[in-house]
C-alpha cells in the first residue's frame, strides 16, 4: 500500500512519541559518537517536518523515501569527518547505496566511555528535573552503545526504566527499590541486544534463507498446533520485520512488528493457547510477550515424519516441486516434534536432509540410497547431548567463576591471537550457560544451552570481524552458521602460536583492585590468567591452578594490609617471580 | 510449476519399436533421476525402468530387460525411452515421473501392441 508521503504514514501510524524515539535509536545506532544534544536537536528537525507533510502530504520532500530524509538529514552533521573518517564518504553516494554504507560503519565495540551509575538521589534529581530528557538520554546510551538493538525492544525497555524510577524515586529506600531493578534491566538488555546482533548477523551474513529456516524451527517449536502454511505466513513476517530493523529501517519496523502482534492476537486459536494472557497487555509488553512465550503443548497425535520424509516414493517428486517449502514442511514436522532439541540441531538434521536428498534423488533408485537417513542424525543429536553433560557436571562441580576459568584457558588455547578483553568477555559469557542452563531438566538444556552459546559466540564473531586475527575464528565464523558451536568445539591447542612476550607489567596490580566490586576484581583475575595463558600456553591446570590460587591469596591479603600499596608492590614482585619459576618463564 | 509431457506412444505390431519420450520443465531436470511407469488397463501401476541424474546408472523391471533402453539429454530436458521387441503385455499408458514417484503427472502417452 503505497502512500504519498512515508513520514507522514509512519509518524501517524506510531504517534509522536514512539516517532521521535524511534528516529533517535535511528540516528545513535549509525552515529554513535555524536553528543546526545545534537541528536536531539536533529531528531527535533525531522519530527518537525514530519508533523508539516501530515498537515499536507503534497508539501515539499513528503514525498521523499525514509532513506533519503535521514540519511540527508545525518549528512548535515559539521563535524562529520574530524568525528568519524572515512564514514563521511557515505554522504558522498546515493541512496540506496548512501544507507548500505552507514550500515557498514556500524561499530559493534564503539569507542565509548564505560556508562557509569550516579547515586540514586542524583538520578532521582534528574529524573524529577526533566523526565523526557532523562529517558531519551537513556535511548541514546544503550541504541550509541549496542547499534543492531531491536529498536521496538528498546522502547519497552526504556517504558520499564521509566517504570522504576517513577516507583522507586518516591520509596522509602529508593535504592534497595531501583538497584535490583536497574541491574535486570542492564542484564536483560545486554541478552537482547546479543539475541538481536545474532538475528543481524544471519540476515546480513548468511541471507534470508538462513533466517527463514531459523524461525521456521523456532516457531514450529513454539506453536506445534499451528499448521505449515500458519507457521509460514509468521515467519515470512517475522523475516519483513528483522530484515527492517537490521537494515536501519526502524519505522518500518516497529510498525510491522505492531501488526504482527496483531494478528498473532487474532488468530491465536489458530496458532497457540499460550497467548491469551500476551494478547491482554499493551502494545510493548505485548510484543515482547508474544515473543518470549512458552512452546505450546505438542498435538497428541502426531504420526512417524519417515511416512512423509523417508517411505514415501514421492519424496523425490515433492522434493523437485518445491525444494524450499518440502524442506520447509520437514524442518516444521521436525521441530514441533523435538522442543528439546536446540534449534541449531534442527537446523542442522534438515541440512543433512537437504544434503542426501540433492544425492540420492540423483540416483536411479532413489528410496534405496535416503532411506537410511534418519540413521544420519543419531550421531549429530548426541554430539550435544553429550557436551552439554560433560559441561554441565563441571560446572557442578566448580561453580561459575571457576567454570569461566576453565572455559578462558580452553579458548585461549584454542584462539590466542584474538584480544585479552575479548577472550575474557566472551568466556565469562560462555560459562553463564552453567547457571543459565544446567538447572534445568534434560528436555530443556540443550535448547536453552546450544540457542544460547550461538549468541555468545556470535559476539565473538562481530567483534573478531572488525579487528582480524585468527584464521581459525574467520574459518568457524563464516562457513557455516549453524556448525560454529561444532566448529569452535573442534578446535584443538594452536600449535602454530608463538608464545607472548613475558611482560611484568600486565601482572603489576595496584590497591585500587581492593575497592572493585566482586566482577570487577573477578575480571582482573580472568585478565591476568588469559595473559598467562598467551605467554605460556602449554601450561597444565594444575600450573595455571596453583598460580591463581596464589595471585588470589595475594590480592586477599594485600587488601587487608595496612600500606596496600607497599604491599602490591613487593609482594606482587615475588609472585611474579614465583609464577615465573613455577610455569617455566 | 513443475509439467512432465509424454509422447511417443501409438499403435504398434508385436516385434515393432517405439521411442517415448518425456518434456520437463519447472524444476532442475540435471539434478534428478527419473523412471517410467506403466498402467494396462484394469491393472495397478508398475515400474519399468529409471535413470540416475547424469544417465550413468540405468535400472529395468525384469520383464522389459534387454528390450527397452531408458536414456536423457539433460541439455533439453528430456527423457527417453526406447522400446524394442515389443509385445501385447506391453500395452498401457507410460508415464514418467521424478525419482521413482508412483503418482501420476503428466496423461501419460498411450502404447498399444497389437496385431
Known amino acids: 500500500d503505497a502512500h504519498k508521503s512515508e513520514v507522514a504514514h509512519r509518524f501517524k501510524d506510531l504517534g509522536e512519541e514512539n516517532f521521535k524515539a524511534l528516529v533517535l535509536i535511528a540516528f545513535a545506532q549509525y552515529l554513535q559518537q555524536c553528543p546526545f544534544e545534537d541528536h536531539v536537536k536533529l531528531v527535533n528537525e525531522v519530527t518537525e517536518f514530519a508533523k508539516t507533510c501530515v498537515a499536507d502530504e503534497s508539501a515539499e520532500n513528503c514525498d521523499k523515501s525514509l532513506h533519503t530524509l535521514f540519511g540527508d538529514k545525518l549528512c548535515t552533521v559539521a563535524t562529520l569527518r574530524e568525528t568519524y573518517g572515512e564514514m563521511a564518504d557515505c554522504c558522498a553516494k546515493q541512496e540506496p547505496e548512501r544507507n548500505e554504507c552507514f550500515l557498514q560503519h556500524k561499530d559493534d565495540n564503539p569507542n565509548l566511555p564505560r556508562l557509569v551509575r550516579p547515586e540514586v538521589d542524583v538520578m532521582c534529581t534528574a529524573f524529577h528535573d526533566n523526565e523526557e530528557t532523562f529517558l531519551k538520554k537513556y535511548l541514546y546510551e544503550i541504541a550509541r552503545r549496542h547499534p543492531y538493538f531491536y529498536a521496538p525492544e528498546l522502547l519497552f525497555f526504556a517504558k520499564r526504566y521509566k517504570a522504576a524510577f517513577t516507583e522507586c524515586c518516591q520509596a522509602a529506600d529508593k535504592a534497595a527499590c531501583l538497584l535490583p531493578k536497574l541491574d535486570e534491566l542492564r542484564d536483560e538488555g545486554k541478552a537482547s541486544s546479543a539475541k538481536q546482533r545474532l538475528k543481524c548477523a544471519s540476515l546480513q551474513k548468511f541471507g534470508e534463507r538462513a533466517f527463514k529456516a531459523w524461525a521456521v524451527a523456532r516457531l514450529s517449536q513454539r506453536f506445534p498446533k499451528a499448521e505449515f502454511a500458519e507457521v509460514s505466513k509468521l515467519v515470512t513476517d517475522l523475516t519483513k520485520v528483522h530484515t527492517e530493523c537490521c537494515h536501519g529501517d526502524l519505522l518500518e519496523c516497529a510498525d510491522d512488528r505492531a501488526d504482527l502482534a496483531k494478528y498473532i492476537c487474532e488468530n491465536q486459536d489458530s496458532i497457540s493457547s499460550k497467548l491469551k494472557e500476551c494478547c491482554e497487555k499493551p502494545l510493548l509488553e505485548k510484543s515482547h510477550c508474544i515473543a518470549e512465550v512458552e512452546n505450546d503443548e505438542m498435538p497428541a497425535d502426531l504420526p512417524s515424519l519417515a511416512a512423509d520424509f523417508v517411505e514415501s516414493k514421492d519424496v523425490c517428486k515433492n522434493y523437485a516441486e518445491a525444494k524450499d517449502v518440502f524442506l520447509g514442511m520437514f524442518l516444521y514436522e521436525y521441530a514441533r516434534r523435538h522442543p528439546d532439541y536446540s534449534v541449531v540441531l534442527l537446523l542442522r538434521l534438515a541440512k543433512t536432509y537437504e544434503t542426501t536428498l540433492e544425492k540420492c534423488c540423483a540416483a536411479a533408485d532413489p528410496h534405496e540410497c535416503y532411506a537410511k537417513v534418519f540413521d544420519e542424525f543419531k550421531p549429530l543429536v548426541e554430539e550435544p547431548q553429550n557436551l552439554i553433560k560433560q559441561n554441565c557436571e563441571l560446572f557442578e562441580q566448580l561453580g561459575e567463576y571457576k567454570f569461566q576459568n576453565a572455559l578462558l584457558v580452553r579458548y585461549t588455547k584454542k584462539v590466542p591471537q584474538v584480544s585479552t578483553p575479548t577472550l575474557v568477555e566472551v568466556s565469562r559469557n560462555l560459562g553463564k550457560v552453567g547457571s543459565k542452563c544446567c538447572k534445568h531438566p534434560e528436555a530443556k538444556r540443550m535448547p536453552c544451552a546450544e540457542d544460547y552459546l550461538s549468541v555468545v559466540l556470535n559476539q565473538l564473531c562481530v567483534l573478531h570481524e572488525k579487528t582480524p586475527v585468527s584464521d581459525r575464528v574467520t574459518k568457524c565464523c563464516t562457513e557455516s552458521l549453524v556448525n560454529r558451536r561444532p566448529c569452535f568445539s573442534a578446535l584443538e591447542v594452536d600449535e602454530t602460536y608463538v608464545p607472548k612476550e613475558f611482560n611484568a607489567e600486565t601482572f603489576t596490580f595496584h590497591a585500587d583492585i581492593c575497592t572493585l566490586s566482586e566482577k570487577e576484581r573477578q575480571i582482573k583475575k580472568q585478565t591476568a590468567l588469559v595473559e598467562l595463558v598467551k605467554h605460556k600456553p602449554k601450561a597444565t591446570k594444575e600450573q595455571l591452578k596453583a598460580v591463581m590460587d596464589d595471585f588470589a591469596a595475594f590480592v586477599e591479603k594485600c587488601c587487608k594490609a595496612d600500606d596496600k600499596e607497599t604491599c602490591f608492590a613487593e609482594e606482587g614482585k615475588k609472585l611474579v617471580a614465583a609464577s615465573q619459576a613455577a610455569l617455566g618463564l | 510449476e513443475v509439467q512432465l509431457v509424454e509422447s511417443g506412444g501409438g499403435l504398434v505390431q508385436p516385434g515393432g519399436s517405439l521411442r517415448l519420450s518425456c518434456a520437463a520443465s519447472g524444476f532442475t531436470f540435471g539434478s534428478f533421476g527419473m523412471s517410467w511407469f506403466r498402467q494396462a488397463p484394469g491393472k495397478e501401476r508398475e515400474f519399468v525402468s529409471a535413470i540416475d541424474s547424469g544417465g550413468a546408472d540405468t535400472r529395468y523391471a525384469e520383464s522389459v530387460k534387454g528390450r527397452f533402453t531408458i536414456s536423457r539429454d539433460n541439455s533439453k530436458n528430456t527423457l527417453y525411452l526406447q522400446m524394442n521387441s515389443l509385445r501385447a503385455e506391453d500395452t498401457a499408458v507410460y508415464y514418467c515421473?521424478?525419482?521413482?514417484?508412483?503418482?501420476?503427472w503428466g496423461q501419460g502417452t498411450t502404447v498399444t501392441v497389437s496385431s
Open positions: 515421473t521424478i525419482g521413482r514417484s508412483a503418482s501420476r
